[in-house]
Amino acid sequence: RTTTCFGDGCQNTASRCKNGGTWDGLKCQCPNLYYGELCEEVVSSIDIGPPETISAQMELTVTVTSVKFTEELKNHSSQEFQEFKQTFTEQMNIVYSGIPEYVGVNITKLRLGSVVVEHDVLLRTKYTPEYKTVLDNATEVVKEKITKVTTQQIMINDICSDMMCFNTTGTQVQNITVTQYDPEEDCRKMAKEYGDYFVVEYRDQKPYCISPCEPGFSVSKNCNLGKCQMSLSGPQCLCVTTETHWYSGETCNQGTQKSLVYGHHHHHH
């Protein structure tokens, strides 16, 4: 956030940039949390825009019995590996076809034991406040589907009647990792020493990190004709003086007519 300065007072301004602001020859360049000519004002909203999507990764192991293991399968650039990968991917795409969050599979390692396939199942969902539940449900469906297919598609009398056959007992879920996104935590961190006063409010399922000085939210502080300003002790209303009134009170809601006060003074002199 920048504020430009013109004229002779600029050099003077340069040495007065506050809150870590730096002078660029024309103006104070303010750090994220501040704005104003001297970076003296605290912003009332911080962009913590969530990622568009949240991902999850499931580490799985299955045992394929319909392919003979060869050393070439360990070499990811070999024809054996490439063909295996193509078929395995095709098979898994069929298995997980009913899961909207399913993105694909990534083989990490093939090893002996028929062919033991260590792989990741990749899941992705659009960000909503309920993303954890959505991905948790998707991982459960993945477990159900892989358990079902590795139980059903098995070799019978050395014959595999499917694209791939599996060893029922070789199916394991090692680990599940979900990208963590915590807007409350991000908001607190980015607000630094003002963290106690910034909160997350949702609008159209999008999180906004705001202080009570940001208008239009349920936590917004109404300063009436005054100006809301954030300090280390919290949001405060700076009350204004008009030609006719002085305003005071916590929310600048108490107006005193100047004429009455002046009249009072004249009466005393």
Epitope: T65, S66, V67, K68, F69, T70, Q79, E80, E83, F84, Q86, T87, E90, M155, D158, I159, C160, S161, D162, M163, C165
Partner: nanobody, 124 residues
């Protein structure tokens, strides 16, 4: 990925014979190989298959009339078709499994690579 090119199709009279060939771009010794056909307006069906160890399988409709064989040295697959019938009219395509596929005793999913096919018309 293996490339497959069929040849040997044509117009033949009922009761006569025809030999189809399939040339593969790579090693076929460690693959299950097969022949499939698709008659006009019908679904594709398996005709014959051969596993890497030479075990063969045939569709009931061609048993005793068709013979599948392969020449590993030439990377070629063949289908000898005898006593041809009008119902054998179809586009015949050669197919291959991935390398090291085992348990090929079906004429279905295991064949993932396919050629463009060669047309066989049986008519008097």
């Amino acid at each position: 990925e293996v490339q497959l090119v069929e040849s040997g199709g044509g117009l033949v009279q009922p009761g006569r014979s025809l030999r189809l060939s399939c040339a593969a771009s790579g090693d076929i010794t460690r693959r299950c190989m097969g022949w499939f056909r698709q008659a006009p307006g019908k679904e594709r069906e398996g005709v014959a298959g051969i596993s890497e160890d030479g075990i063969t399988i045939y569709a009931d409709s061609v048993k005793g009339r068709f013979t599948i064989s392969k020449d590993n040295a030439k990377n070629s697959l063949y289908l000898q078709m005898n006593s041809l019938r009008a119902e054998d009219t179809a586009l015949y395509s050669c197919a291959a499994s991935i390398l090291n596929r085992v348990g090929c005793r079906q004429l279905s999913y295991e064949y993932i690579y396919r050629g463009q096919g060669t047309m066989v018309t049986v008519s008097s």
